[in-house]
């Protein structure tokens, strides 16, 4: 497993998915409607 | 320059399905929902729904559930909107709408339903 | 679905006038998610005025709105020609988003 201080913040952080990879952020728009269009 | 490019105007018979698109240009399509919104000639604007790009999840009014069905392309940066059933009372302007406060909207999709 | 409540649906204005349009909802909704959108004849709607009281990219400082709860509003502090259009105010709170059912400025 990736052992890199970047890693291992990851990994204290809870990011890292059981494949060992940094999960990538998913844009879910939150307040939407506080966003005029 | 962010531009919402929507498609031409249709003509269309009474129980016919309709698809128009709005192509996203000048910004990152799937960092925002892509709204639209309904405009019966000479009355007020109804939202629709939006969709959000990045994950294809939509959110709809209840009155177009089954009559409007929203989709996206990444590869294109087009949003879609298919129209299904039509009636008479389906003939409006249709403009798609980037979330957002930057305020950047298509110039609309006139729809005519008539036999 | 939250109802919104324009007032007056028309309105003739002279040049440099102090115009008000009032916005009221059916239910209170935070500031937050209160916009509104002016539209001139023949061409798309365009956002003036977004969470309630700040002023969207290119519009004049000449409008302003404010409002809180179910009550707000839209002022234009000197009417101008080019400022002929329908207003609109919007909630985005709930689902469905609503739009007010328009006021038609005029000049006289």
């Known amino acids: 497993s990736c052992n890199t201080a970047t890693c291992v913040t990851h990994r204290l952080a809870g990011l890292l998915s059981r494949s060992g990879g940094v999960v990538k952020d998913n844009f879910v728009p939150t307040n939407v409607g506080s966003k005029a269009f | 320059e962010v531009q919402l490019q929507q498609s031409g105007p249709e003509l269309v018979k009474p129980g016919a399905s309709v698809k128009m698109s709005c192509k996203a240009s000048?910004?990152?399509?799937?960092?925002?929902?892509m709204h639209w919104v309904k405009q019966k000639p000479g009355q007020g604007l109804e939202w629709i729904g939006y969709?959000?790009?990045?994950?294809?999840?939509?959110k709809y009014n209840e009155k177009f559930k089954g009559k409007a069905t929203l989709t996206s392309d990444k590869s294109s940066s087009t949003a879609y909107m298919e129209l299904s059933s039509l009636t008479s009372e389906d003939s409006a302007v249709y403009y798609c709408?980037?979330?957002?406060?930057?305020?950047?909207w298509g110039q609309g999709t006139t729809l005519t339903v008539s036999s | 679905e939250i109802v919104l409540t324009q007032s007056p649906t028309t309105m003739a204005a002279s040049p440099g006038e102090k115009i008000t349009i009032t916005c009221s909802a059916s239910?209170?909704?935070?500031?937050?998610?209160l916009h509104w959108y002016q539209q001139k004849p023949g061409f798309s709607p365009k956002v003036l005025i977004y969470?309630?009281?700040n002023l969207a990219s290119g519009v004049p400082a000449r409008f302003s709105g404010s409002g809180s709860g179910t009550s707000y509003s839209l002022t234009i502090g000197t009417m101008e020609a080019e400022d002929v259009a329908t207003y609109y105010c919007?909630?985005?709170?709930?689902?469905?988003?609503?739009f007010g059912s328009g006021t038609k400025l005029e000049i006289k």
């Open positions: 709408a980037k979330g957002g406060n930057d305020g950047y």
């Open positions: 000048g910004y990152t399509f799937t960092s925002s929902v």
């Open positions: 969709i959000n790009p990045y994950n294809d999840g939509t």
């Open positions: 239910s209170s909704i935070s500031s937050i998610y």
């Open positions: 969470r309630a009281s």
């Open positions: 919007q909630q985005g709170s709930t689902i469905p988003f609503t």
